[in-house]
């Protein structure tokens, strides 16, 4: 028996369902009584789901997994993982035993989009050219860790005096806070871009300083 899985990682959004594809080619006359299918976490060998002795033995993993029972006889050994969590990320082994056996591993990459950044200034009043100002760009509930880029109004990257921190919450999602310290000119626009490297999703935030008062672009 030969087991086939997709070589590319499966990307799944947090709280959605994911299908880990696995297939084998049944011989003529194959019956489910011959099939032994085991899904497990590759690294820890923790059992996730199994089909043995002719029947679905059920989920051994948070009761969030299911096979496609009607498709098994056709060689579809895929696993459905429901309500994906950050902690589900990793490699899963699909093991199929009939006359002989084979296995293959498929990677699950979990992702969550970052929120539109909110921008804050400190100080936020009585600003004068030459003042040092701290601009904070905050984006929430994303995964995996973000890449953060700052640019000025002309699109020139700002790399000096940037401090970025990323903190995971209880669900494993990251809140990003990036702080830019700049000396104010007469006016200027400062924008931050928060990129999710897996989803290739960019979330933009910007602040424009035009003397007095300060203006923030309307929400997109």
């Amino acid at each position: 028996v030969e087991v086939q899985v997709s070589e590319d990682p499966v990307v799944a959004l947090v709280d959605t369902d994911a299908t880990l594809r696995c297939s084998f080619s049944p011989e003529p006359g194959f019956s489910l009584a011959q099939l032994n299918l085991i899904w497990q976490l590759t690294d820890t060998k923790q059992l996730v789901h199994s089909f043995t002795e002719g029947r679905d033995q059920g989920s051994a993993y948070s009761n969030r997994t299911a096979l496609f029972p009607d498709l098994l006889v056709q060689g579809n050994a895929s696993l459905r993982l429901q309500r994906v969590r950050v902690t589900d990320e990793g490699s899963y082994t699909c093991f199929v035993s009939i006359q002989d056996f084979d296995s293959a591993a498929v990677s699950l990459q979990v992702a969550a989009p970052y929120s539109k950044p909110s921008m804050t200034l400190e100080p936020n009043k009585d600003l004068r050219p030459g003042n040092m100002v701290t601009i904070t760009c905050s984006s929430y509930q994303g995964y995996p860790e973000a890449e953060v880029f700052w640019k000025d109004g002309q699109g020139v990257p700002l790399t000096g005096n940037v401090t970025t921190s990323q903190m995971a919450n209880e669900r494993g999602l990251f809140d990003v806070h990036s702080v830019l310290r700049v000396v104010l000119g007469a006016n200027g626009t400062y924008s931050c871009l928060v990129r999710n490297p897996v989803l290739q999703q960019d979330a933009h935030g910007s602040v424009t300083i035009t003397g007095q008062p300060l203006t923030f672009p309307p929400e997109a």
Partner: antibody, heavy 119, light 109 residues
């Protein structure tokens, strides 16, 4: 071609334990099913148990349940069989065997390890 | 637990003769049955797997047949090197566990 190399002969006292190793070379160890079979002098073959390293699942013949432990170290491509509470009837040649990658049929055998249990 | 019974216990034949060895299972083993040959001081050698498939390098004079509970190993024309002990072995479906028959000794008449 897969080859299995077993550890050397052992002489043990009744009540003690023995651990026999079986090192595989020439293939993908994690995708083997390794069995342990013993043969007492002048007697037939007796399957003791086996392990599929990629699953980490070992299972044992009823007769040896609770007295035998089979493990596998994927990093060294080595399987182990430990038999405890030895008695004189455990004097035998102990073989490891495999079908190689993805096969259950035992067509590749180690050279055997003689274990003698004597007071 | 499945029990395999081999018959006869000893078979005395001459080179060139046909040998028929029997293996009966106490319950159906599908086709997960293998035959091994063992000579004194040597490890067993796989001859037949899945009831009828010859293992790599095994001469065509060896053949296996049967399914369910009754299986046969046939050696069409005995060569001097064929005199040895023969074991049948079944494999359960899951988890994979094995049982050997007690063996048939094939000796020169």
């Amino acid at each position: 071609q897969v080859q299995l190399q077993q550890s050397g002969a052992e002489v043990k006292k009744p009540g003690s334990s023995v651990k026999v190793s079986c090192k595989a070379s020439g293939g993908t160890f994690s995708s083997y099913a390794i069995s342990w079979v013993r043969q007492a002098p002048g007697q037939g073959l007796e399957w003791m148990g086996g392990i599929i390293p990629i699953l980490g699942i070992a299972n044992y013949a009823q007769k040896f349940q609770g007295r035998v432990t089979i493990t596998a170290d994927e990093s060294t491509s080595t399987a182990y069989m430990e038999l405890s509470s030895l008695r004189s009837e455990d004097t035998a040649v102990y073989y490891c065997a495999t079908g190689g990658s993805g096969r259950y049929a035992l067509d590749i055998w180690g050279q055997g390890t003689m274990v003698t249990v004597s007071s | 637990e499945i029990v395999l019974t081999q018959s006869p216990a000893t078979l005395s034949l001459s080179p060139g003769e046909r040998a028929t060895l029997s293996c009966r299972a106490s319950q159906s083993v599908s086709s997960y049955l293998a035959w091994y040959q063992q000579k004194p001081g040597q490890a067993p050698r796989l001859l037949i797997y899945d009831a009828s498939n010859r293992a790599t390098g095994i001469p065509a004079r060896f053949s296996g047949s049967g399914s369910g509970t009754d299986f046969t190993l046939t050696i069409s024309s005995l060569e001097p090197e064929d005199f040895a002990v023969y074991y049948c072995q079944q494999r359960s479906n899951w988890p994979p566990s094995y049982t050997f028959g007690q063996g048939t000794k094939l000796e020169i008449k």
